[in-house]
Amino acid sequence: WGFKDGIFHNSIWLERAAGVYHREARSGKYKLTYAEAKAVCEFEGGHLATYKQLEAARKIGFHVCAAGWMAKGRVGYPIVKPGPNCGFGKTGIIDYGIRLNRSERWDAYCYNPHAKECGGVFTDPKQIFKSPGFPNEYEDNQICYWHIRLKYGQRIHLSFLDFDLEDDPGCLADYVEIYDSYDDVHGFVGRYCGDELPDDIISTGNVMTLKFLSDASVTAGGFQIKYVAMDPVSKSSQGKNTSTTSTGNKNFLAGRFSHL
């Protein structure tokens, strides 16, 4: 799993990135005129994304196979990974140009810098992830994915700085899940909740995924989770390697399952 030669090796795409998101009409794909697309974005407190904003989002993993209106009457869509069914085998913004007929019907690409976002694709050597709104309590009905991909040969050292999620025996309500892979299917490491700080985790490779989910009731203080890149030369043995399991934390379910 990972990112090689600028290409994702599986299909984890962001639904929202750098403030940009895709919208379609309630009746489905390609039903919005330019004026309607503009209204949809404005209704949500944003505006139509510019070409530059869409490209900035694409660069961090925003990939949608649907043409949509952008600012100034432009139409296009962002492709991260080329494929036979979308984007004519190209990457970048597939650009249909500025449309003379604003009554044509497409989807919409909106930009809202104020929207509370969570998750994303991270390639920095170190970063801190926070639950949305931290240090305030997180909200109900949240779902966030953080996908980490470092250089080949590097590993990821994950440590929990603050941790307070709704506590229940099976961590079925609110939880953080860690995967030793670039998706939330393979390499399951553990599911965490409650207020005990989990042990550090060290990945087996250069990729890792964190998933945060909160249900429809009861919230708590949230979390801060830090990662640092470990170079191949590093002989660091501190922390907990994902290939081992821990029984020390009652709020930790560990193992290598494809699903819980």
Epitope: A25, R26, L32, A35, E36, K38, A39, V40, D140, N141
Partner: antibody, heavy 120, light 112 residues
């Protein structure tokens, strides 16, 4: 900012008609539908219907079909609702409200309401 | 028509408390594309309604994060995490999945 300014109170005789107006500003009039809602004290809110100024299309609550006529004047960004054959049951407050039927965001900004009194 | 039933009719709360209002529909509000169109409004005395939440859980522009919506299918909930004096008024739900659009009967939030 988005504003919907409704016409003043109306006093009408039973069996007569009345035409209420809703003048909008602060947004592109033709991109949003205008909904009309009836609010009777103690009986909650009832949706009458909407008109989409872009093409003049309408959608009605069957209960109000034939009783309400919805029109727009795009040059003045104003929507109108004409109510026919009024009875005392129609004495109440009527709101206009902006909506986005094609997106499903529902109804966001509302006018201040127009009070209609039906009395002989 | 989808009949919307709101409970409770009246909700006395102390300032700073959490308030929870329920809205139940006689038919599912999920459309064929999997979207659910359920909104929540607050109508303060002598004012027109103001949109708080659209599509079940999305806060409208400028709405404070003390307000949150949840639910699916036929059962929906509005929560106010820490009630303030300015939150008092009548709350109602509106479904816009089915025509005719239908409103809940309203819940009056008042000081205990």
């Amino acid at each position: 900012q988005v504003q919907l300014q409704q016409s003043g109170p109306e006093l009408v005789k039973p069996g007569a008609s009345v035409k209420l107006s809703c003048k909008t500003s602060g947004y592109t009039f033709t991109s949003y539908d205008i909904n009309w809602v009836k609010q009777r004290p103690g009986q909650g809110l009832e949706w009458i219907g909407w008109i989409y100024p872009s093409d003049g299309s309408t959608k009605f609550n069957e209960k109000f079909k034939g009783m309400a006529t919805l029109t727009v004047d795009t040059s003045s960004s104003t929507a109108y609702m004409e109510l026919h054959s009024l009875t005392s049951e129609d004495s109440t407050v009527y709101f206009c409200a902006r909506g986005l039927w094609y997106y499903g965001g529902g109804v966001d900004y509302w006018g201040q309401g127009t009070s209609v009194t039906v009395s002989s | 028509d989808a009949v919307m039933t709101q409970t409770p009719l009246s909700l006395p709360v102390s300032l700073g408390d959490q308030a929870s209002i329920s809205c139940r529909s006689t038919q599912s509000l999920e459309d064929s594309n999997g979207n659910t169109y359920l909104n929540w409004y607050l109508q303060k005395p002598g004012q027109s309604p103001q949109l708080l939440i659209y599509r079940v859980s999305n806060r409208f522009s400028g709405v404070l994060d003390r307000f949150s919506g949840s639910g699916s299918g036929t059962d929906f909930t509005l929560k106010i995490s820490r009630v303030e004096a300015e939150d008092l008024g009548v709350y109602f739900c509106l479904q816009v999945t089915h025509v005719p659009y239908t409103f809940g009967g309203g819940t009056k939030l008042e000081i205990k």
